[in-house]
């Protein structure tokens, strides 16, 4: 009996530009002889329904139809026909099919590959055109994919050390698509320093499918006319 097993759950998620290994394990009742078996990997795009051959392994020959695509002959010996794709790109997401032939038997499995890109986040202070005691803080998130993203603002005071979500005076702009297919977005928080306590910590909180934990960038209100420290102005909080 010949059986193929793909990633549990049927979906694999990988970061953009990563060297991804798309899993495909072979279960066969006898020891595998790689010189008398065949492996073919196919890819079907999310945008069009045509299946394309990515990689082929037959006996003493292998051929990559996508640059760098490889199945390890050394891993194949122990039943692992996983496909390595170096430098995975957003447009390579879709359905991958692993087809195994041990004549006269054939088995196959499919998996959905999702490619994600994590946002980089930074805080900026914009005082241009603002009234006295008023400041606008901008939280820029860039280079993320997919488009869905959640940006919130929180504050912590000495009186209330637990974060409180801010809903007023927050404007989040539209997402902008970059040339490489990733997205950018900016969220703005307007503050009136005369109404806020010095020592209050403000946080921009970014939640995205690519992140295990939210991305947090913060600044502290000082007694003097508040502004970001130099590091806060220039640092990338990724």
């Amino acid at each position: 009996d010949l059986k193929v097993e793909m990633m549990a759950g049927g979906t694999q998620i990988t970061p953009l530009n990563d060297n991804v290994t798309i899993f495909c394990n072979i279960f066969y009742s006898q020891p595998l002889n790689i010189t008398s078996m065949g492996i073919t990997w196919f890819w079907k795009s999310l945008t069009f329904d045509k299946e394309v051959k990515v990689f082929e392994f037959f006996g003493d020959h292998q051929e990559a139809f996508r640059p760098g695509a490889i199945v390890s002959p050394w891993r194949l010996k122990s039943g692992d026909a996983s496909l390595r794709l170096p430098g995975i790109q957003l447009e390579e997401a879709g359905e991958y099919r692993c087809e195994v032939v041990v004549t006269p038997l054939k088995a196959q499995g499919t998996v959905q590959l999702e490619v994600v890109a994590s946002p980089a986040s930074r805080l900026l202070l914009d005082q241009v055109g603002m009234k006295e005691n008023e400041d606008k803080y901008m939280c820029e998130s860039s280079g993320f994919y997919p488009e869905a993203i959640n940006i919130t603002w929180e504050k912590q005071t000495q009186k209330f050390p637990h974060p409180i979500e801010i809903s007023e005076d927050v404007i989040t702009g539209p997402t902008i698509k970059n040339m490489d297919g990733t997205f950018n977005v900016t969220s703005c928080l307007k503050l009136n320093s005369s109404q806020e306590d010095p020592g209050t910590v403000y946080q921009c909180v970014v939640r995205h499918a690519s992140l295990h934990t939210p991305l947090r960038s913060n600044f502290t209100l000082t007694a003097a006319r508040h502004s970001l420290s130099e590091t806060e102005k220039t640092d990338n909080f990724s």
Epitope: N19, T21, F23, N25, D60, H61, Q62, I70, S72, P73, W74, R75, K77, S78, G79, D80, S82, R84
Partner: antibody, heavy 120, light 111 residues
């Protein structure tokens, strides 16, 4: 920085078993196989086998088949080599080595070695 | 099993002079256009370290005075100018077939 840290020296009696561990760090554990190689005192290198941490698949040198068991614990990025029914000629330094398997096959990083002495 | 025979088994070289080690395989170690021959150096009291893989590719961090060549059954490791730190035992290894096998080793000493 890639590191392979092996367990300490062992002294065993003939007929006993020994289990050597190899803790990996500094790379994605499942992206490389783990080779095991031994070296008897004053002798050359001898390949024992390898394990694929991705699926637990193993390849053994026929010479050791039935006596050696290679395993991994992915959760702690650790590989193990257990050798049973020990004989005096199993006295050697045992090495684990990270093995590239996609673009060629070679051991690019090695553990410091574990000395196993079999003596009655 | 593929048997690898190294020559010479030992050599003594003056610093700055070249050195060459041969490794002959009992059958071809080529597969699909590549040669699966690797070279390692084991310095005294240390584990082996990779020098060259796929017959001629220098491993990262290895000085370019080391070079490898050959295909099929005949392979050579060359050191263009031997340095004191090059002492140790050099092993060739084939990874085309299991069991992966090593040559018996060549001991390099400094004169």
């Amino acid at each position: 920085e890639v590191q392979l840290v092996q367990s300490g020296a062992e002294v065993k009696k003939p007929g006993a078993s020994v289990k050597v561990s190899c803790k990996a760090s500094g790379y994605t554990f499942t992206d490389y196989n783990m080779d095991w190689v031994r070296q008897a005192p004053g002798k050359g290198l001898e390949w024992i086998g390898d394990i694929n941490p991705n699926n637990g698949g193993t390849l053994y040198n026929q010479k050791f088949r039935g006596r050696v068991t290679l395993t991994v614990d992915k959760s702690i990025s650790t590989a193990y080599m257990e050798l049973s029914r020990l004989r005096s000629d199993d006295t050697a330094v045992y090495y684990c080595a990270r093995s590239e398997v996609f673009y060629g096959n070679y051991a690019d990083y090695w553990g410091q070695g574990t000395t196993v002495t079999v003596s009655s | 099993d593929i048997v690898l025979t190294q020559t010479p088994l030992s050599l003594s070289v003056t610093p700055g002079q070249p050195a060459s080690i041969s490794c002959k395989a009992s059958q071809s170690v080529d597969y699909d256009g590549d040669s699966y021959m690797n070279w390692y150096l084991q310095k005294p009291g240390q584990p082996p370290q990779l020098l060259i893989y796929a017959a001629s590719t220098l491993h990262s961090g290895v000085p370019d005075r080391f070079s490898g060549s050959g295909s099929g059954t005949d392979f050579t490791l060359k050191i263009s100018r031997v340095e004191a730190e090059d002492v140790g035992v050099y092993y060739c290894q084939q990874s085309k077939e299991d069991p992966r096998t090593f040559g018996q080793g060549t001991k390099l000493e400094i004169k």
